[in-house]
Interface confidence: medium
């Protein structure tokens, strides 16, 4: 676990824990229903999403310099994809197949949230926009946008874990 | 009192346009999906389109993808419906829907759209 | 798409009759079903909600059944009021459809 004061977390075991997010995402993606392709829209779902952005210092030089700024990113988009990924949307009717990883994917991003959490310490963590929808028709392209957004998230967070686990480790 | 007031039907040549409104009061609209539905002379409902409470997603129907787009304007309290490259079948009246906590709990009166040369 | 069939198409009724309509839909649409009432010139009336819930201010001579597939629409005691059509709708997925309708008469 990372501890205040800028300590490093455990970078192998969160590239690990990442990769598997990756392959998590990925393959929950398509079974979260089939999409339509009558649904569509701007990207709404991920306009208020944590984004990893050039500011975040999770370049090679802003990891360095001080990972703690990067990491409390990811760990904001964690806990945020984490609730959102047990809310409703994904809880409501239509019913997930019982074979989904999206309750693997839902206990990973909890773990390695978990690993990122200082001791201690709570970063602050980002607000969930309502998008709570009423209708069931309403969560399969909620759900698919959600996944979609995620998918990018921990594709970066995985890089920015297997940098740090090849070049920051002690 | 919730109310609904559709505008903007007409008659209209096949191929051409036409912009329906739907006034919204007695409720907080931007925070309710609406709906478009509509009914051909003499025949049974069809589902149109719909639209997220802030406009960030819309869903169409197959008939009517690519011809019509849904919108909306919270700070008028205003649905809309562009029909383009407008075609016979697409005679009907037109009403707006309300996705409350029952869906299409309220309805328009409904504005007839008339394509016809 | 999800398709949805109503029966009868139409019916013939007195007042004071029990009237019951159904709907079935092509696959499973757990309760996701309205009912629908709407007289001539005029728009629908939501009546019934996720398949048994009466929409406020609906007199409860109305109700509604079923889950899965098959739907029922029942009108306890018929007013001069209920003659229209009436349609189902499922709200389950996109497309959201209506079944045909089924035309109350005066008998």
């Known amino acids: 676990r990372a501890v205040p004061g800028g300590s490093s977390p455990a970078w192998t075991q969160c590239q690990q824990l990442s990769q598997k997010l990756c392959t998590l995402a990925w393959s929950a993606h398509p079974l979260v229903g089939h999409m339509d392709l009558r649904e569509e829209g701007d990207e709404e779902t991920t306009n208020d999403v944590p984004h990893i952005q050039c500011g975040d210092g999770c370049d090679p030089q802003g990891l360095r310099d001080n990972s703690q700024f990067c990491l409390q990113r990811i760990h904001q988009g964690l806990i945020f994809y984490e609730k959102l990924l047990g809310s409703d949307i994904f809880t409501g009717e239509p019913s997930l197949l019982p074979d989904s990883p999206v309750g693997q994917l839902h206990a990973s991003l909890l773990g390695l949230s978990q690993l990122l959490q200082p001791e201690g310490h709570h970063w602050e963590t980002q607000q969930i926009p309502s998008l709570s929808p009423s209708q069931p028709w309403q969560r399969l392209l909620l759900r698919f946008k959600i996944l979609r957004s995620l998918q990018a998230f921990v594709a970066v967070a995985a890089r920015v874990f297997a940098h740090g686990a090849a070049t920051l480790s002690p | 009192e919730v109310q609904l007031l559709e505008s903007g039907g007409g008659l209209v040549q096949p191929g051409g346009s036409l912009r329906l409104s739907c006034a919204a009061s007695?409720?907080?609209?931007?925070?309710?999906?609406m709906h478009w539905v509509r009914q051909a002379p003499g025949k049974g409902l069809e589902w149109v389109s719909s639209?997220?409470?802030?406009?960030?997603?819309?869903w169409y129907a197959d008939s009517v993808k690519g011809r019509f787009t849904i919108s909306r304007d919270n700070s008028k309290n205003t649905l809309y419906l562009q029909m383009n490259s407008l075609r016979a079948e697409d005679t009907a009246v037109y009403y707006c829907?309300?996705?409350?906590?029952?869906?299409?709990?309220?309805w328009g009166q409904g504005t007839l759209v008339t394509v016809s040369s | 798409d999800i398709q949805m069939t109503q029966s009868p198409s139409s019916l013939s009724a007195s007042v004071g009759d029990r009237v019951t309509i159904t709907c079935r839909a092509s696959?499973?649409?757990?309760?996701?079903l309205n009912w629908y009432q709407q007289k001539p010139g005029k728009a629908p009336k939501l009546l019934i909600h996720v398949a048994s819930n009466l929409q406020s201010g609906v007199p409860s001579r109305f109700s509604g059944s079923g889950s899965g597939t098959d739907f029922t629409l029942t009108v306890s005691s018929l007013q001069p009021e209920d003659f229209a059509i009436y349609y189902c709708q499922q709200t389950y997925s996109i497309p959201l459809t209506f079944g045909q309708g089924t035309k109350v008469e005066v008998k």
């Open positions: 829907a309300r996705v409350g906590a029952a869906d299409f709990d309220y």
């Open positions: 007695g409720f907080t609209f931007s925070n309710y999906a």
């Open positions: 696959q499973n649409i757990n309760s996701f």
């Open positions: 639209i997220w409470p802030s406009g960030g997603i819309t």
